[in-house]
């Protein structure tokens, strides 16, 4: 039987300073149980950008309704785009534990920043 | 429409074992966590245990008792019960998980139970 | 563990009467609770899941309302099919998922 998938569609996505971007993510199951995080960059030093369950992330607001019934869209916007945004965002899939562990990650889709227009 | 069918419930002595199952149908079950809810005579729900793909997750009365499975290719829940005990007298309801945004898991559709009685 | 505290244990009510019962948890939950109906010799049913979303099917007159620690579930108008007994079960932090002890409504 088909393993989990975590389908990042875009490898890229260019995005005026200014604007919002909207990262793309999508997963085939419902299972295993545990959240989907995101991050910009990869390995031990990769930074935190949206966790549904705790944290303050005001820059973030999930695409799906928050009310969406077995959902496996986990897509995100990130408002007010800086250059400081620039890099490689993963949507990353762990699997319930104690501590939660991470199970699958997507292929990441790397975010440019271009100049404001104006 | 999704069908829950629990079987294998029965009158068993304290320390036998006992094999419960749940035949699923009406939605894609390979997707899907299930879990099983135990209800005491005359008492409230009690969760008994969850599995998702091979993760399981058990309540601390039944852990190192009871084993969770299933059978993807059958649409079948199974829960093994193992060391039984006067206790675990109770409906064993099989019940489908479902998921809301980012959370979960709930219980939105129940089978009808079936009842297991340990007692000498 | 979250603990689940249903009040009260038992309401009796006239046909027609506005029902409010009580689920108080140990700790914030956020909006991570459903609420369920049992008959007896029956099987639970979903109603309210996210605190406030009715489950499809479910009649307008219930209602959720609550988050954090505090949650409610109305039925604006009790119907003879109302008599049961109502479940709360908080899903923000688990295993072990939790119910609170019910809360049983009986014709007055």
């Known amino acids: 039987e088909e393993e989990l998938q975590v389908i990042q569609p875009d490898k890229s996505v260019s995005v005026a300073a200014g604007e919002s971007a909207i990262l793309h993510c999508t997963v085939t199951s419902l299972i295993p149980v545990g959240p989907i995080q995101w991050f910009r960059g990869a390995g031990p030093a990769r930074e935190l950008i949206y966790n549904q369950k705790e944290g303050h992330f005001p820059r973030v607001t999930t695409v799906s309704e928050s009310t969406k019934r077995e959902n496996m869209d986990f897509s995100i916007s990130i408002s007010n785009i800086t250059p400081a945004d620039a890099g490689t965002y993963y949507c990353v899939k762990f699997r319930k534990g104690s501590p939660d562990t991470e199970f699958k990650s997507g292929a990441g889709t790397e975010l440019s920043v271009r100049a404001k227009p104006s | 429409d999704v069908q829950l069918v629990e079987s294998g419930g029965g009158v068993v002595r304290p320390g036998e074992s006992l094999r419960l199952s749940c035949a699923a149908s009406g939605f894609s079950f390979s997707i899907y966590a299930v879990s099983w809810v135990r209800q005491a005579p005359g008492e409230g729900l009690e969760w008994v245990s969850t599995i998702g793909a091979d993760d399981t997750y058990y309540a601390d009365s039944v852990k190192g008792r009871f084993t969770i499975s299933r059978d993807n290719s059958k649409n079948t829940l199974y829960l093994q019960m193992n060391s039984l005990r006067a206790e675990d007298t109770a409906v064993y309801y099989c019940?489908?998980?479902?998921?809301?945004?980012?959370?979960?898991?709930?219980?939105?559709?129940w089978g009808l139970g079936t009842l297991v009685t340990v007692s000498s | 563990e979250i603990v689940l505290t249903q009040s009260p244990a038992t309401l009796s009510v006239s046909p027609g009467e506005r029902v409010t019962f009580s689920c108080r948890a140990s700790q914030n939950v956020r909006s991570d609770i459903a609420w369920y109906q049992q008959k007896p010799g029956q099987a639970p049913r979903l109603l309210i899941y996210a605190a406030s979303s009715r489950d499809t099917g479910i009649p307008d007159r219930f209602s959720g309302s609550g988050s954090g620690t505090d949650f409610t579930l109305t039925i604006s108008s009790l119907q003879s099919e109302d008599f049961g007994v109502y479940y709360c079960q908080q899903y923000y932090d688990w295993p072990p998922f939790t119910f609170g002890g019910g809360t049983k409504v009986e014709i007055k």
């Open positions: 019940a489908k998980d479902s998921t809301v945004g980012w959370s979960g898991d709930f219980f939105d559709y």
